[in-house]
Amino acid sequence: EKAMVDGSWLDLAKRSKLEAQPFAHLTINATDIPSGSHKVSLSSWYHDRGWAKISNMTFSNGKLIVNQDGFYYLYANICFRHHETSGDLATEYLQLMVYVTKTSIKIPSSHTLMKGGSTKYWSGNSEFHFYSINVGGFFKLRSGEEISIEVSNPSLLDPDQDATYFGAFKVRDID
């Protein structure tokens, strides 16, 4: 009987630790996408609607803030698209990029953790163009550090929640 009680306590402890594991999945806020063709920071993301969820992390001022030290898997998926119904591209040669950046407040510094993308030729003769970037990686993050997303050509972002998103989840503690 004691062994059974110990086992269930162990399960409970495991489960509560699992439930406390920080994670976030943030989706683009389509109503507030900046315009421009240069690199801009995307600050408007959903954290609590549709596929978007957050737990034991904080979303503030366009940045995902780490609340617990640990090793995290970070990921970002960015889709760019253009359909001729919205007009013509002013240039057919495009650099479509995403940058995942870590900012530390304690020691003011900023580092690009991941980048991805390509230069593209989107011919004016085509009705529709689409390009997707996915980046992911494993990083040691400290409490208070902030993760943000920058992209080029934000006016070409696909605003759907299944197209443009980023997130993180803690994989293990720092020993």
């Epitope: 421009g36 063709s37 001729e84 119904t85 007009g87 591209l89 002013a90 240039t91 006016s155």
Partner: antibody, heavy 126, light 103 residues
Framework: QVQLVQSGAEVRKPGASVKVSCKAS????????IHWVRQAPGQRLEWMGW????????KFSQKFQGRITVTRDTAASTAYMELRSLRSEDTAVYYC???????????????????WGQGTLVTVSS | EIVMTQSPSSLSASVGDRVTITCRAS??????LNWYQLKPGKAPRLLIY???SLQSGVPSRFSGSGSGAEFTLTISSLQPEDIATYYC?????FGQGTKVEIK
């Protein structure tokens, strides 16, 4: 205030060419595209082409491809539209119009024509 | 190629009347639809862009609605200075125009 001032009326014989100018003022010429639109007597408005005043990129209607050239002089804040091999059905009022999209802010030619020139009547007659 | 069709081609109304012009696209164009006013010998004027946004300086009696393939321009109270031809436009395609006259 934003103004587009076009050159005066022209009369040409069939087979000849015409070049219409469009001088912009009141805004940074290089930051916007200029479109050319015409209206023949009793006809609907007809889009001809655009030029991105910043980089000189152009796009033309298939109908005018090979007959039209659009250029710009950024120092003079002026766009030019030349139409060659004129025929009687090219008799129309030719307009230049500014695209509303600022190219510093975005890369889409939006086809919202927020300011127009006063029009240039081109008559093609033998 | 998208074709824009306007109706009616002309209309006659009294000052103060509510006037409605319809524009149909041959396929869905989302909300990428603009309305212009043309008066003889004058530069055309953008009234409505993006189906329903009023261009700066345009009187509030003008309004636009619709999305997909069907759009409407409404003049809530026709004024003598509104006598003109009105055109809908999506990118490279214009409607054939609606001539508005006073009764």
């Amino acid at each position: 205030q934003v103004q587009l001032v076009q050159s005066g009326a022209e009369v040409r014989k069939p087979g000849a060419s015409v070049k219409v100018s469009c001088k912009a003022s009141g805004y940074d010429f290089s930051n916007y595209a200029i479109h050319w639109v015409r209206q023949a007597p009793g006809q609907r408005l007809e889009w001809m082409g655009w030029i991105n005043a910043g980089n000189g990129n152009t796009k033309f209607s298939q109908k005018f491809q090979g007959r039209i050239t659009v250029t710009r002089d950024t120092a003079a804040s002026t766009a030019y539209m030349e139409l060659r091999s004129l025929r009687s059905e090219d008799t129309a009022v030719y307009y230049c119009a500014r695209d509303s999209e600022n190219m510093v802010r975005g890369i889409i030619i939006a086809y919202y024509f927020d300011y127009w020139g006063q029009g240039t009547l081109v008559t093609v007659s033998s | 190629e998208i074709v824009m069709t306007q109706s009616p081609s002309s209309l006659s109304a009294s000052v103060g009347d509510r006037v409605t012009i319809t524009c149909r696209a041959s396929q869905s164009i989302s909300r990428y639809l603009n309305w212009y006013q043309l008066k003889p010998g004058k530069a055309p004027r953008l009234l409505i862009y993006g189906a329903s946004s009023l261009q700066s300086g345009v009187p509030s009696r003008f309004s636009g609605s619709g999305s997909g393939a069907e759009f409407t321009l409404t003049i809530s109270s026709l004024q003598p200075e509104d006598i003109a031809t009105y055109y809908c436009q999506h990118t490279r395609a214009f409607g054939q125009g609606t001539k508005v006259e006073i009764k």
